[in-house]
């Protein structure tokens, strides 16, 4: 309304004993320039005198007189727009209402601003996003309803009492709309941050502690798992039993389902934290892991490589190459599935053991006709000796020998 002076400033300002208060303020008088300004503390209107009573913190008239004891209060304004004030230092008993008594040539106005001065530095306030999820960056905000040019402060972030390594952005506002100091820290929380305490610490310019606020991080994450196997080396013999246990070291929220995977494929009807494999066979060798899910998603354990050891299976012989031409070279390969791998081989030619041949491969550099026939082998490992397989036939081609005419 046009009959009022127009003021803009924060409604309430906050400070603490010994700090300072900076009051950003603008105004528009009804007519002409400001001629007199008095800053009252808790002003009360006296109907008898038609004047305001209260402690005068600052006075400025046409004569320019300022009470000498009020050097801590400064009017930083002007005669037509700016009514900014500074109180440095500010004291506990400055709390209450500040009254800005303004007078122009023909008009008067009393503008009230609330001042809240606490005994000790009040804590900042940490603001967290509604949900924090592992590996998704979040911004933590620390807000303090205080800023003053004459009293530098800093906000520091701590994780479990140790300064955080991530960089923060600190901003201050000293405007007619708001007065605050804010620190924003962006970081990528990991599951291990769940339950940890984050602190925003208010410090003076020298790093001295003034106050703080703390929050406990609630980091949503997939289940974190540990897999244990008995025996611990995951090496067993055919017919033995194996037990695998899945342990949830952390899950937020709680887990809902459990499953086991072998070589990436889900094992049917295995939905408990223990996987019992009785009388294992060699086909049960492979990579096992457990998978536990919660509302965030599935978590997988590390893989355990189960080795089921068995004696060599009946062996087969591969010949490179048959038929072979006399004088060429030939290689025989004994093939037998076994775990561990065979360490010894026995070779047979036409059912008769070949002396001195104990390797997986037999190499004949120069084939002769008498080398023709059936070759078989037997593989052996620490668990036993395999059976001799059917063998392979070597055919040797050669030119006619001892030609006789009939």
């Amino acid at each position: 309304d046009s009959s009022k002076w127009v003021f803009e400033h924060p409604e309430t300002l906050y400070a603490w004993e010994g700090a300072c208060v900076w009051i950003p303020c603008t105004y528009r008088a009804l007519d002409g320039d400001l001629e007199s300004f008095i800053l009252f503390h808790n002003p009360e209107y006296n109907k008898n005198t038609s004047k305001f009573d209260g402690t005068r913190l600052y006075e400025s008239t046409k004569d320019g007189k300022v009470p000498s004891e009020q050097k801590r209060v400064q009017f930083l304004g002007d005669k037509n727009k700016n009514c900014t004030l500074s109180i440095h230092p500010v004291h506990l008993n400055d709390s209450g209402q500040l009254g800005l008594r303004m007078e122009s040539k023909t008009e008067k106005w009393m503008e009230r601003i609330h001042l809240n001065v606490s005994e000790r530095p009040f804590p900042p306030h940490i603001q967290l996003p509604p949900e924090i999820q592992e590996s998704q960056e979040v911004t933590l905000t620390c807000l303090l309803n205080f800023s003053c040019y004459g009293y530098p402060i800093q906000l520091q972030w701590l994780l479990e009492g140790v300064p955080m390594r991530q960089a923060a952005v600190t901003s201050t506002s000293l405007t007619i709309k708001s007065v605050f100091t804010r620190s924003e820290l962006k970081f990528s929380p990991q599951w291990s941050h769940h339950g940890k305490i984050v602190t925003c610490q208010l410090q003076d310019a020298d790093g001295k502690f003034l106050s703080n606020d703390t929050v406990q991080l609630n980091v949503k994450h997939t289940p974190k798992l540990e897999i244990k196997v008995t025996p611990s080396d995951a090496i067993v013999r055919e017919g033995d039993s194996v037990t695998m246990t899945c342990e949830v070291s952390s899950s937020n929220p709680e887990y809902t389902t459990v499953s086991w995977l072998k070589d990436g494929t889900s094992l049917k009807k295995q939905n408990t934290f223990t996987l019992n494999l009785r009388e294992v066979t060699k086909d049960q060798s492979g990579k096992y892991c457990c998978q536990v899910s919660n509302d965030v998603g599935p978590g997988r354990s590390e893989e355990v490589f189960l080795q089921v050891q068995y004696a060599p299976e009946p062996s087969t012989v591969q010949i490179l190459h048959s038929p072979a031409v006399e004088g060429s070279q030939v290689e025989f390969l004994c093939m037998s599935l076994a775990n561990p791998l065979p360490t010894n081989y026995t070779w047979y030619h036409n059912g008769k053991e070949m002396q001195g041949r104990t390797e997986e491969k037999v190499h004949i550099p120069k084939i002769l006709p008498w080398h023709a026939g059936t070759y078989s082998c037997v593989a052996e490992n620490i668990l036993g000796t395999g059976q001799r397989g059917p063998g392979a036939e070597l055919d040797v081609q050669y030119p006619p020998k001892k030609v006789t005419t009939v």
């Epitope: 590996s135 998704q136 960056e137 800093q154 520091q156 390594r165 960089a167 923060a168 990528s188 990991q190």
Partner: antibody, heavy 119, light 106 residues
């Protein structure tokens, strides 16, 4: 192992824009931040900006109006785009990854790509 | 932004000597990071979190400091240590580097 490699145009005309690609291996761009740092010949290092695992960015305020950082997680590539280049933008441009997910010093650097701004 | 001032700008020393260079911050930082750079190469992280040695860095390098004052020390200078050393802060955006200390062999 962790590796980063920059590739750029080499020569850029004044007032034109610059595009550099950083191709990474040995880690996931969806989990780690990647930063851009430049170094004019014979001078010191200047941090340009960064891209977070989730894709949000932070820039050096002095260059913010000219910079854009983006990425393609599936191709393991991070892109730096800079507009209105002047001769004082001539520098070696590096991409770097911190020790941790988002902090801890630049433990991994690319070999750098030299960008010369000249007519 | 936080300004990091390194001193001295140039340092000449002989093999076997102890070398100390400093980095002063315009406002308090939580941790300091140190890099070594040789001509034609990318920077190499030497020290992280003020005093921790990065992987593969010889134990003759050490870092210390707090608040606004930090230092990098080489207990016994070796010929291969001749390089430019940069400090860097990770407390406030924008991340900033010092102008560098050039370490030369006498």
């Amino acid at each position: 192992q962790v590796q980063l490699k920059e590739s750029g145009p080499g020569l850029v005309a004044p007032s034109q824009s610059l595009s550099i690609t950083c191709t990474v291996s040995g880690f996931s761009l969806s989990r780690y931040t990647v930063h851009w740092v430049r170094q004019p010949p014979g001078k010191g290092l200047e941090w340009l900006g960064m891209i977070w695992g989730g894709g949000s960015t932070d820039y050096n305020s002095a260059l913010k109006s000219r910079l854009s950082i983006s990425k393609d997680n599936s191709k393991s590539q991070v892109f730096l785009k800079m507009n209105s280049l002047q001769t004082d933008d001539t520098a070696m441009y590096y991409c770097a990854r911190p020790h941790d997910f988002d902090a801890g010093g630049f433990a991994y650097w690319g070999q750098g790509t030299l960008v010369t701004v000249s007519a | 932004q936080i300004v990091l001032t390194q001193s001295p700008a140039i340092l000449s020393t002989s093999p076997g000597e102890k070398v100390t260079m400093t980095c002063s911050a315009s406002s308090r930082v939580n941790y300091m990071y140190w890099y070594q750079q040789k001509p034609g190469s990318s920077p190499r992280l030497l020290i992280y979190d003020t005093s921790n040695l990065a992987s593969g860095v010889p134990v003759r390098f050490s870092g210390s400091g707090s608040g606004t004052s930090y230092s990098l020390t080489i207990s016994r200078m070796e010929a291969e240590d001749a390089a430019t050393y940069y400090c860097q802060q990770w407390t406030s955006y924008p991340l900033t580097f010092g102008a560098g200390t050039k370490l030369e062999l006498k």
